[in-house]
Amino acid sequence: EPLPWAPESLKVSINSTHQCLHLQWSVHNLAYHQELKMVFQIEISRIKTSNVIWVENYSTTVKGNQLLHWSWESQLPLECAKHFIRMRSAVDDATTPEQRFWSNWSSWEEVDVQNSLGHEPLFVFPKDKLVEEGSNVTICYVSRSQQNNISCYLEGVRMQGQQLDPNVSMFNLHNVAFIRETGTNIYCKVDRGDDIKGIVLFVSKILEEPKDFSCETRDFQTLSCTWDPGRDTGLLKQLPQSYTLFESFSGKKTLCKHKGWCNWQVAPESQEMYNFTLTAENYLRKRSVHILFNLTHRVHPMAPFNVLFKDVSVTNATMTWKVHSTGNYYTLLCQVELYGEGKVIQKHNVSVKVNGELVLSGLEPDTEYSAQVRCANANHFWKWSEWTRQNFTTVEAAPSEAPDVWRNVKSVQGYCVVTLFWKPLSRLQANGEILFYNIVVEDLDRPSGLQLLSVPAPANRTELTLDQRAYQIHVTANNSVGTSPASVLVVSGDPGDEEVEEERVKGTEDGFSLSWKPQPGNITGYIVEWCDRPRDPLCDLQWKHLGPNTTSTVISSDAFRPGVRYNFRIYGISTEMVPYLLEKKTGYSQELAPSDNPRVVMSNLTSHSFTLSWKDYSTESQPSFIRGYHVYLKSKAGQCHPGSEKAVLSDDSVCCKYKIDDPKQKMFVVGNLQPESFYEFLVTPYSAVGEGPHGAFTKVTTPDEYSPM
């Protein structure tokens, strides 16, 4: 006999957008207060009742007069085919499910959405469906006419489908990919017909779990939570992901306005523990992450402020700063970095409650420093605050070093003209701005005879005219605080410089390597002197101080040029501060071939000889050491006499070449000539790196034998 609690009043509604069938029914004959565990078997057929595509047993507890609901999502859009639904019921006896007594089936309920489609010749479903990347999707077309051949395309590529009935074909898309934010285009068209019908399949990239979720407070009033939302789902702003923060201890929840951060008001009742759940959610899915923390362990202090320097002296300064009050009087650890010339020169750690103080010592006078401070929770380190930076300058001190002084002495009309040179003190030596230099000239024969001269900075030279006696010169640098130690130098009328022999040195890319013999007796040091621009009238005098135990040095300068001769003088400085010349060196950083030939004067022309001379040719001003000269002689006969050799010039002309090996020999007699003959000559200097240019030859014709001299 049929079960008394059969399903009745079965109603089926549809939700096309979600491709869902909603079933609603009731069970009669149940007393109002009665509860019964029941199972309902639901069958769904497609196209015809015999084509069952879904069977499901739905178990629930039924109360009297209760409306029951069940939903089913169809893979195939509901518009694509008729669906039929029926159900039956049984009492749910879990102990013997195989012995269930089923009620009769309800009558089939038919759902046919196609009836409401309208009168167009072609439809494509589903419309504007939103799916996740990687999903499988079924689409279909419904045609109002059976005659036409219909083709469907996915992004322009024809799809293979399967016919459900003469008017309907369906297409299964597997593992759909994200193509563009405006969706994937699918369209169908009648092959020889009218129009195209398209749908858009909106494909979302899979919503990612938020990464690096973290919260912190800067002021104990607001918790700032941040996270990395991961890759964008690729959907335009109509259906983006939303983010929600839920805190379980307080039970509060907030919808975040931004994709990657959210603020949470700290409870005034001093809640210490927080248990947050961050939920990312879009139309298709939810993703959650959790963090549990103690508020005092997540303090990211605000940057210190009011950074000041007091009691700034020559070598010390007291740095003070304030930190923002947090209400909870816990200790901050502050880190101080002191910068000098852009580099960290000191690091300090200081514990601070409200005000910080630190004495910076070991500083240089008149130096600009920069100090920066940042703070973090001392008990539970979380994050450093931002740095706060402030500059200060130490106080000036008297210059600490004597200026580096040298001189140039010339005798002019019985007087001694002394040009004094000094190098500016370095910043570390000057200890402040140098305002002037004091020069004291002391006559060593008359110690009471003092001359004082003041030269304003930034001058680096002065000229003194003295008589031929010995003088001691003191030079000091002065700033607003005081005077430097003095540089002392003795000058006398006769420097005795000229008796020293000059020695040649070979320069390299690195400069000139100079060495000298050590001097016996008391010597305080050596000075090497040279000119950076020897061809200029002012010559740019340079000097280098060396210790008493040094007998070699390398002199290098950016001013050194190839083809320029540099002259070096090495002086010893006696204990009485008297400089005396020890050695002279001369050389080239790089020798170049001679650039011009001597201006030659011809004389004593006879029928058999003539004399060539080039007395005013200066070998010192040449771009290399001149080793000698070549005299070239061209003649019609082309014969070369002893003492000369045949030479072929660059223009293939042949001549005779005479070689002079002494650079001081600036005269040459060309002999063995024929009377009334035509000759051409050229004189070129030569050096280790080449000879002068083969320019124009000078023409000469010898007279007959009887012509007067």
Partner: antibody, heavy 118, light 107 residues
Framework: DVKLVESGEGLVKPGGSLKLSCAAS????????MSWVRQTPEKRLEWVAY????????YYADTVKGRFTISRDNARNTLYLQMSSLKSEDTAMYYC???????????WGQGTLVTVSA | DLQMTQTTSSLSASLGDRVTISCRAS??????LNWYQQKPDGTVKLLIY???TLHSGVPSRFSGSGSGTDYSLTISNLEQEDIATYFC?????????FGGGTKLEIK
């Protein structure tokens, strides 16, 4: 036959507002996405806005975002374009289009002229 | 924005001629290229969509081809009624953009 008829043309001052309508007939309006496309006095065509068949998806050109609103009434078979904060560069002939494929304007109305001038 | 360029702004041809109008995209548009015809009275019609598919009611003398960034519209046998301005348009990437148009005239 597909028929799209725009209306609402007018002369507006800069900063003013105007609402355009497009009456659709000859097809099931609710089945199709629709767009507005305009043609400037220099005869350049510019896509303005798009709305999906159900109205869930709406896109705008950057030049009109925040000033123009596209909407549809499927019961009335009508497409709308609410234009506000109008600028002189919005002066154009506005066409309503039916889009069977996203970004393809298969059928066009005859156009309605909007002039923005002081 | 993706730029569409029609290098020829006007073109003269004789009736019966084979005419080709070209269009270049500033980046790959995956064949989402449409061609429109605008008659002198302002009427606009879709001729070809998805590079080469003829829209319903469009004569078969019209054809389209291309890929990547270079596309063209060909009229194989020019007729009087084809006198119009032709626009290309990409539908691959927002914002959807049009070429500047090519005006076709009779010699």
């Amino acid at each position: 036959d597909v028929k799209l008829v725009e209306s609402g043309e007018g002369l507006v001052k800069p900063g003013g507002s105007l609402k355009l309508s497009c009456a659709a007939s000859g097809f099931t309006f609710s089945s199709y996405a629709m767009s507005w496309v305009r043609q400037t006095p220099e005869k350049r065509l510019e896509w303005v806005a798009y709305i999906s068949s159900g109205g869930d998806y709406i896109y705008y050109a950057d030049t009109v975002k925040g000033r123009f609103t596209i909407s549809r009434d499927n019961a009335r078979n009508t497409l709308y374009l609410q234009m506000s904060s109008l600028k002189s560069e919005d002066t154009a002939m506005y066409y309503c289009t039916r889009d069977p494929i996203t970004g393809t304007f298969a059928y066009w109305g005859q156009g309605t002229l909007v002039t923005v001038s002081a | 924005d993706l730029q569409m360029t029609q290098t020829t702004s006007s073109l003269s041809a004789s009736l019966g001629d084979r005419v080709t109008i070209s269009c270049r995209a500033s980046q790959d548009i995956n064949n989402y290229l449409n061609w429109y015809q605008q008659k002198p009275d302002g009427t606009v019609k879709l001729l070809i969509y998805y590079t080469s598919t003829l829209h319903s009611g469009v004569p078969s003398r019209f054809s389209g081809s291309g890929s990547g960034t270079d596309y063209s519209l060909t009229i194989s046998n020019l007729e009087q009624e084809d006198i119009a301005t032709y626009f290309c348009q990409q539908g691959n990437t927002l914002p959807w953009t049009f070429g500047g148009g090519t005006k076709l005239e009779i010699k």
